[in-house]
């Protein structure tokens, strides 16, 4: 009777997280390789061998101007190179885009900045979140997030707080006060409007998100921290 | 000799012209086919909003969906029966969680909540099957042999799983795999 269980909640599908994501490999080199070959042909056309000395003399007689046929050939050669490169890029890129369902029609919402979250961070509502596992003091957490080019977790609205509370345990947030006589402020120096429980305790001057609510805690105590970076 | 050279350049120009034309038509066909193919998708889907990122193959997800390791997850706040959960995920162009390893929801490993997953017992195959018809790996849940085959499976991201009446109400997570 050792059934593993303790709660109500939710689930999801899977894949191997360690699997390397597929990237269109080698497209750059293959294109440049082809370009090299075509440029080589072009150079050969532009540098006639010794057998072509006669034509050079004719050019001299015509005031060093190449015949229009050569000029046309050179222009068409360049066009060919450009077209060839475009075709190759298209051949490489189209299956990749299809594989990722990338099309104008998939943009169902107002256009917004793409993810760019570091690996192993999560994205939610135009923000990246680092889900920490280590325990640190409030100040150490602040520095740890700064070193990750982000900020200690901030709560922008009730909806975000509910979401975070559903997946995270207690966590430091970027809100503090200098003493119980001072107001709660964010790490950006803005006044913090939401209610923080236990604010009357003079020893508790840093804020914590704890299952759907905010409470004060001792800044020197060790807690899990999470970082946030807005996109 | 000059006439021969002129003729040679004309020949080269003509050949290059034909090559250019064929390349242009190839390009046109490629682009036409690809955009026709890509445009088959409906203009609005309630599932994840897919946008290619510049620096990775991953894509971003729709509002209120969580993006993690190139997947989008919808974490419900409501409790539903297993069947209701399955249908709600389907309506979002996604499905209930199919696990290939227990650290898929690593970002939620501290959660102490359980979620319906897309696993049910098939009398026909006498096996626990995922929604896509694939069989449950025996290494995923060591206790799966004790599961009541009439029940559905609830899972905690910490790695715990248990069987519960499919009529029980649990929260659920929908997943859409992007790659």
């Amino acid at each position: 009777m050792n059934k593993q269980r303790g709660t109500f909640s939710e689930v999801s599908l899977a894949q191997d997280p360690k699997r390397q994501q597929r990237k269109p490999k080698g497209n750059k080199s293959s294109i440049s390789g082809t370009e090299q070959e075509i440029f080589q042909v072009e150079l050969n056309l532009q540098n006639p061998s010794l057998n072509h000395q006669g034509i050079d003399k004719i050019y001299d007689c015509q005031g060093l101007l190449p015949p229009p046929e050569k000029l046309t050939a050179e222009v068409l050669g360049i066009i060919c190179i450009v077209l060839m490169a475009t075709v190759l890029k298209t051949i490489v890129l189209i299956p990749f885009l299809e594989q990722n369902n990338f099309s104008p029609n998939t943009r169902t919402q107002k256009a917004r900045h793409c993810g760019h979250c570091p690996e192993e961070w999560i994205t939610y509502s135009n923000s990246c979140y680092y889900i920490g596992k280590e325990r640190r003091t409030w100040e150490e957490s602040l520095l740890a997030c700064t070193s990750k080019n982000s900020s200690l977790l901030s709560i922008d609205n009730e909806e975000e707080m509910k979401f975070l509370a559903s997946i995270l345990p207690s966590s430091w947030i970027g809100v503090f006060r200098n003493s119980s006589h001072h107001p709660w402020v964010t790490i950006n120096g803005l006044a913090f409007k939401h209610k923080i429980k236990d604010s009357d305790n003079a020893e508790l001057n840093c804020a914590v998100l704890q299952v759907n609510r905010l409470k004060s805690a001792q800044c020197g105590s060790s807690m899990i921290y999470h970082c946030k970076h807005k996109l | 000799m000059a006439v021969f050279k002129t003729t040679l350049w004309r020949l080269i120009s003509g050949t290059l012209g034909i090559i250019c034309l064929s390349l242009m038509s190839t390009l046109g066909i490629l682009l036409k086919n690809s955009f026709t193919k890509l445009s088959i998708e409906p203009a609005f889907t309630p599932g994840p909003n897919i946008e290619l990122q510049k620096d990775s193959d991953c894509c971003s997800c729709q509002e209120k969906w969580v993006g993690y390791r190139c997947n989008c997850y919808f974490i419900s706040s409501e409790q539903k029966t297993w069947n209701e959960s399955r249908h709600l995920c389907a309506s979002q162009k996604s499905s209930l969680l199919q696990l290939q390893n227990t650290d898929e929801l690593d970002f939620m490993s501290s959660s102490q909540q359980f979620y319906w997953i897309g696993l049910s017992y098939s009398e026909e195959h006498t096996a626990w099957l995922w929604e896509n018809g694939s069989a449950l790996s025996q290494y995923l849940f060591p206790s799966f042999e004790t599961f009541n085959t009439k029940n559905c499976i609830a899972y905690n991201p910490n790695g715990n799983a248990l069987d519960e009446s499919c009529e029980d109400k649990n929260r659920y997570i929908c997943k859409q795999q992007l790659i």
């Epitope: 303790g6 | 029966t81 109400k169």
Partner: antibody, heavy 120, light 107 residues
Framework: EVQLVESGGGLVQPGGSLRLSCAAS????????MNWVRQAPGKGLEWVST????????YYADSVKGRFTISRDNSKDTLYLQMNSLRAEDTAVYYC?????????????WGQGTLVTVSS | DIQMTQSPSSVSASVGDRVTITCRAS??????LAWYQQKSGKAPKLLIY???SLQIGVPSRFSGSGSGTDFTLTISSLQPEDFATYYC?????????FGQGTKLEIK
């Protein structure tokens, strides 16, 4: 305000039966798992049984399995514990407890308890 | 079944003291642990859940820590109303099990 009120306890002979009830109020009863926990006189706490929010899944301690049955009536916001084949060691205060919203394994509200005495 | 062992079984302390009670699980339970306070003749009261989360309405002088097999309940500055019996409980798997209790008495 959450309230849980147990009833149905009393003196019963070994081998006898008793049905405990727990009337719940102040929360959405049908959304939470419910539990019975007991405490023998002068002893510690012992988990007895858990029932899921819909009543479809039940769990029992080995010491009561096959003798006790937990059930619920969500239309009446009431939890029950049917106790059969009672033994002297079942003598205890029986508490009805609500599962915590964060995790059903924690008990955030408890009733005042009802005493069950099994004695001849 | 997972066994929960509390220590000490009883402790004497004075108002204002800092008190620590420990609880050890016979196998790893991650952070699936709760602490309850029970006063004589009363129902238990949830103090801490998920090892370190303070239940709403519980004074902040109570704190919990630990993960895996070793857990601690700390009362930073003992108040007169804190003298009671404290129980830990694992919620990792069925059957849920409680520690034997730690009685906190006035010195």
């Amino acid at each position: 305000e959450v309230q849980l009120v147990e009833s149905g306890g009393g003196l019963v002979q070994p081998g006898g039966s008793l049905r405990l009830s727990c009337a719940a109020s102040g929360f959405t009863f049908s959304s939470y798992a419910m539990n019975w926990v007991r405490q023998a006189p002068g002893k510690g706490l012992e988990w007895v049984s858990t029932i899921s929010n819909s009543g479809g899944t039940t769990y029992y301690a080995d010491s009561v399995k096959g003798r006790f049955t937990i059930s619920r009536d969500n239309s009446k916001d009431t939890l029950y514990l049917q106790m059969n084949s009672l033994r002297a060691e079942d003598t205890a205060v029986y508490y009805c407890a609500k599962a915590h919203y964060y995790a059903r394994g924690y008990f955030d509200y408890w009733g005042q308890g009802t005493l069950v005495t099994v004695s001849s | 079944d997972i066994q929960m062992t509390q220590s000490p079984s009883s402790v004497s302390a004075s108002v204002g003291d800092r008190v620590t009670i420990t609880c050890r699980a016979s196998q790893g339970i991650s952070s699936w642990l709760a602490w309850y306070q029970q006063k004589s003749g009363k129902a238990p009261k949830l103090l801490i859940y998920a090892a370190s989360s303070l239940q709403i309405g519980v004074p902040s002088r109570f704190s919990g820590s630990g993960s895996g097999t070793d857990f601690t309940l700390t009362i930073s500055s003992l108040q007169p109303e804190d003298f009671a019996t404290y129980y830990c409980q694992q919620a990792n798997s069925f059957p849920y099990t409680f520690g034997q209790g730690t009685k906190l008495e006035i010195k």
